[in-house]
């Protein structure tokens, strides 16, 4: 939702948690802020504290309840607003109809690990964290490799369009440092987007047995 | 205190239209979805749509067939659903429903009798 | 559509007996579970909301438990006033669905 120079911008993990984001030219200093959610459907509701992120733009998290638990599906819609106190009221900045399941972001996959690992090959498996049973198999996702010399951004992205909570690094180079990342997003919902990128896993490639070409 | 009043009974030939009403009180009518609900002699509960009197939208069973429509009226909180084409295996109890988690306040039902 | 079976479909217990009523999904629905009480009447209540809240003015002695697809409405001390037909429902996906209940009688 924008009004003129405001933007409110919240994502659902599809679990217990929607991340909000406010961002504000000229925005009120010194003022108390929060994001409250209410749900057409549910009897919950709930409000976060929104904190600075940046000059302009501030961030909190809507903790609806244990992280596992679902507790919106897809026939929900929740009303999210921006209140900021004004003296002694609040004052609705910003409003949006959130539809959770339209507005997917996961969390970054975890427990990454190196299976198995060879001169040129490396096998990594990791697992996704409080994603809804909803999406059965119905998820995508993305991995990329650091190399010595090189930066992140220049690393080429591989893509798994499936369910596949593992991937085997070919062509590797013998005895030498690599870090792995992936992150993952569901199939659903029209404004749905990539999760942030795991921790790095670092992992070293065995070397080349002496006397061998390699 | 939440209190959902339905219209009376009714009896209607087959192929003709009924529309039953559902007025609310004791709460914000706009915040709460409506739900309708029958209930067929001797038979368990069929959900036959919902509506969101603070918008209009709605979802409705397709098992109905396009035969349903709900509406509401703010300005008098109630809402209204209307099942057109009846059958005799249209005959049964229909119900409004607040829902919040649940459906939380019933209506005390409207019979509905389709009969030659 | 989402299936719910109820079992047992009747039953019959003495005053002061634990009651136990069974529903089960066809699929995952999380903990979007709620059961009603409908009396001889034909008056529908909530009783139980979101697997296990206990609705305002619902006797303490009605409690529910599950996750998943299988769910179980349990009544600790049967009462004569519980004489009713049970109904579980899923609000986890349209359509919404019931169960195809289950009548309590006194013995």
């Known amino acids: 939702a924008v009004n003129g120079t405001s933007q409110f911008t919240c994502f659902y993990n599809s679990r217990a948690n929607i991340s909000c984001v406010w961002s504000q030219d000229g925005a009120l200093q010194d003022t108390s802020c929060q994001v409250h959610a209410w749900p057409d459907r549910r009897r919950w509701n709930q409000t976060c504290e929104l904190l600075p992120v940046s000059q302009a733009s501030w961030a909190c998290n809507l903790i609806l309840g244990a992280p596992d638990s679902q507790k919106l599906t897809t026939v929900d819609i929740v009303t999210l607003r921006v209140l900021c106190r004004e003296g002694v009221r609040w004052r609705v900045m910003a409003i949006q109809d959130f539809k959770p399941f339209e507005n997917l972001r996961l969390m970054a996959p975890i427990s990454l690990q190196v299976v198995h690992v060879e001169t040129h090959r490396c096998n990594i498996s990791w697992e996704i964290s409080q994603a809804s049973h909803y999406f059965e198999r119905h998820l995508e996702f993305e991995a990329r490799t650091l190399s010595p010399g090189h930066t992140w951004e220049e690393a080429p992205l591989l893509t798994l369009k499936q369910k596949q909570e593992w991937i085997c690094l070919e062509t590797l180079t013998p005895d030498t440092q690599y870090e792995f990342q992936v992150r993952v997003k569901p199939l659903q919902g029209e404004f749905t987007t990539w999760s942030p990128w795991s921790q790095p896993l670092a992992f070293r490639t065995k070397p080349a047995a002496l006397g061998k070409d390699t | 205190q939440v209190q959902l009043v339905q219209s009376g009974a009714e009896v209607k030939k087959p192929g003709a239209s009924v529309k039953v009403s559902c007025k609310a009180s004791?709460?914000?009518?706009?915040?709460?979805?409506i739900s309708w609900v029958r209930q067929a002699p001797g038979q368990g509960l069929e959900w036959m749509g919902d509506?969101?009197?603070?918008?209009?939208?709605?979802n409705y069973n397709e098992k109905l067939q396009g035969r349903v429509t709900m509406t509401v009226d703010t300005s008098t909180s109630t809402a209204y659903m209307e099942l057109r084409s009846l059958r005799s295996d249209d005959t049964a109890v229909y119900y409004c429903?607040?829902?919040?988690?649940?459906?939380?306040?019933w209506g005390q039902g409207t019979l509905v009798t389709v009969s030659s | 559509d989402i299936q719910m079976t109820q079992s047992p479909s009747s039953l019959s217990a003495s005053v002061g007996d634990r009651v136990t009523i069974t529903c089960r999904a066809s699929?995952?629905?999380?903990?979007?579970l709620n059961w009603y009480q409908q009396k001889p009447e034909g008056t529908l209540k909530l009783l139980i909301y979101?697997?296990?809240g206990l609705h305002s003015g619902v006797p303490s002695r009605f409690s529910g438990s599950g996750s998943g697809t299988d769910f179980t409405l349990t009544i600790s001390s049967l009462q004569p006033e519980d004489v009713a037909t049970y109904y579980c429902?899923?609000?986890?996906?349209?359509?919404?669905?019931f169960g195809q209940g289950t009548k309590l009688e006194i013995k």
């Open positions: 429902q899923q609000d986890n996906n349209h359509p919404y669905t």
């Open positions: 699929q995952d629905i999380s903990n979007f």
């Open positions: 979101y697997t296990s």
């Open positions: 509506i969101y009197p603070g918008s209009g939208n709605t």
């Open positions: 429903a607040r829902e919040r988690g649940g459906f939380d306040y």
């Open positions: 004791g709460y914000t009518f706009t915040s709460h979805w």
